[in-house]
Structure formats: C-alpha cells, structure tokens
C-alpha cells in the first residue's frame, strides 16, 4: 500500500528573467527513492538517479540547474515557462508518487501588485 505523500513548494508566480526553485518532499513512507524525474507537460527536464546522479535534458542545460537537494532551479525564466511541473518519485517498493507545481511567469512590466519572486 502506498502511504507516502508529496509536499511541494506550492504554486509560484515569478518574473521574466528571474530564477525560481521547484522542490518536492516525499514523507510518510519508508520506501527507498530510486529516481526523481522532473517534467513539464510531456517534456523531461531532468533526472536525479540515486546511483547515477543528475542528468539534465540537453535542451534545458543552459537554464536548469540541479538542486538544492532533489529540487530543481529554473533560471532566465521566460513567459513560455508558464505551466505545470511534475516531480515524479520512483520508489521501492511503493511505486510512483507525483507532485505538481504550477509556475506562472509574468512580464516585469505587469504591475499586478507584485506577488512575484526573483532569486538573485
């Protein structure tokens, strides 16, 4: 039986050109995490394998950095990065757990009261 739960950073609104950290945390299970995949829609962004370490998809190499931890840092954000991101935890013996984070990237000129973030 799958008892675990995934906690995420929560949805994030960020400014174009900035950076954000996407993080998920698997709790309430003793299952072993064998691999974490980060995906957007149907695109694979990165893999963190327990044995082999990180692999960043070539098309994202310039703008995606591994970590912190099993998280992912997205840099030089564009409006087209807006969308849903998935952290997919492959575990043994439980199976697969998925967390979801929606990222909205806004033009810096959008002045709708500044609920946006930029990591220096």
């Amino acid at each position: 039986m799958m008892t675990g739960t995934i906690e995420t950073t929560g949805n994030i609104s960020a400014e174009k050109g900035g950076s954000i950290i996407l993080q998920c945390h698997l709790s309430s299970t003793t299952a072993q995490v064998t691999q974490v995949n980060w995906e957007q829609q149907d695109q694979l962004l990165a893999i963190c394998n327990a044995d082999l370490g990180w692999h960043i998809s070539p098309s994202f190499k310039d703008r995606v950095a591994p970590g912190p931890g099993l998280g992912l840092t997205l840099q030089s954000l564009t409006v087209n990065d807006t969308g849903e991101y998935f952290c997919i935890y492959h575990t043994y013996p439980d199976g697969t757990y998925t967390g979801r984070i929606f990222l909205e990237v806004l033009e810096s000129s959008v002045a709708e009261h500044g609920a946006r973030f930029q990591i220096p």
């Epitope: 929560g10 949805n11 994030i12 609104s13 409006v79 087209n80 807006t82 806004l106 609920a115 973030f117």
Partner: antibody, heavy 119, light 112 residues
C-alpha cells in the same frame, strides 16, 4: 470591458460528448489563462483546470482528466471545453473564468452553461 | 487534494450587521516563498460569480471597502462590515496555492 460569452444550455444523452465555448472580448486573449469551473446542485464549485493561451499548456484537476479536454482558438479569442462520455453526474453549470495574473485566482467569469444529461 | 472548509454554511443577517465568514484549509496555503493564494467570491443567483478579495486581503477593483480579508497559514476570514441588500448570496473561498485549486463549500448569506 472584459466579457466572457458562453454558449447556451445543452440537453445531451448519456454516453454522448459535447463542447462548450467561451468567447473572450475586452482584453488581450493570449495574456491570461482561462479556467473552467463546475457547479453541481446549484452549490458546490470545483476547479476543472486551465489552459494557457500563449503556449497551449494545460493543467487539469486529476478528477476531470479524461472527462474534460480544454482547447482554444486564438484567432477568435475563444476557449473550449469538451466533455466526454457524459453521465448524469456531469449535469451541472459550467463556468469559464479568466485567471488573475500573479495570484492564482479568477477575476472575470462567464454566465455559465447549463448541461443536462438525460435520456 | 487540499480540503477547504468554510463556516458557517448559512448566515442569517439583518441589513447593517457586521459578519465574518471563516475558511480553513487542511494544509498551509503559504508557498515556499511565503506567499498565500487565497481568494473570496460572491455568487448571486442568476449572475456570474464575482471576485471580491485575492491574495488574502487585496480588494478587487470596484469592490466596496466594507469587504475585507485577513488570515494566514490555514485560517482565513472574510469580514463584511455593514451588510447591504446587494451582499446577499453565496460566498466561496478558493485556495490556489496547491494543485488542484479547491473551493470551500460555500456560505449562504441570507436575510433573517
């Protein structure tokens, strides 16, 4: 003035599929996400999902994955929601609503489309 | 999914009253950057729902200042300082911090 004009009420048979339209005017259609919301029994509201006009991305409530398909036509500033394999549980009022940028909220809503599933 | 619980279910009022509606979530609605996406809506019969408050406490354009929002974490409140006839209807809170977005069950503001 922002307006979201939804298609009219529908009476459909169980097992059929149907498409609701939501025509946007008064703003730049591609600058805002479009959300869809279900209201059952005149009370409960459920978020179905959203579509991102500028890149075509979608986000669904898993409960509605396989039930609702969100699409759009940028040339006519119209968002669509197709409801598949309808059952009596799908009888409800469906709203489209524009996303409020930066706040994961909905600022302007359509009038709603009433869908009745009955044989 | 995050469960959002609204109380009371029904709120009988007299015009001029001050009322509060509570909205509680099953987990914190603050994201990792400390920002909370909690909004409030009024739905009158035969009309479209209307946005009142977003980001906990920001009044949407055209919303009278008798409406105010407050709270943090898992506990939020909508206050209406002086009830007017046009305020009657169903009130809903919505959390947009976690996927999927979820609404409270609604509070019906009705005349005593």
């Amino acid at each position: 003035e922002v307006q979201l004009q939804q298609s009219g009420p529908e009476l459909v048979k169980p097992g059929a599929s149907m498409k609701i339209s939501c025509k946007a005017s008064g703003y730049s259609f591609t600058d805002y996400t479009m959300n869809w919301v279900k209201q059952s029994h005149g009370k409960n509201l459920e978020w179905i999902g959203l579509i991102i006009p500028y890149n075509g991305g979608t986000s669904y409530n898993q409960k509605f994955k396989g039930k609702a398909t969100l699409t759009l036509d940028k040339s006519s500033s119209t968002a669509y929601m197709e409801l598949l394999s309808l059952t009596s549980e799908d009888s409800a009022v469906y709203f489209c609503a524009r996303g409020l940028r930066g706040y994961f909220a909905m600022d302007y809503w359509g009038r709603g489309t009433s869908v009745t599933v009955s044989s | 999914d995050v469960v959002v619980t609204q109380t009371p279910l029904s709120l009988p009022v007299s015009f001029g009253d001050q009322v509060s509606i509570s909205c509680r979530s099953s987990q914190s609605l603050a994201n990792s950057y400390g920002v909370t996406y909690l909004s409030w809506y009024l739905h009158k019969p035969g009309q479209s729902p209307q946005l009142l408050i977003y980001g906990i406490s920001n009044r949407f354009s055209g919303v009278p200042d008798r409406f105010s929002g407050s709270g943090s974490g898992t506990d939020f409140t909508l206050k209406i300082s002086t009830i007017k006839p046009e305020d009657l209807g169903m009130y809903y809170c919505l959390q947009g911090t976690h996927q999927p977005w979820t609404f409270g069950g609604g509070t019906k503001l009705e005349i005593k």
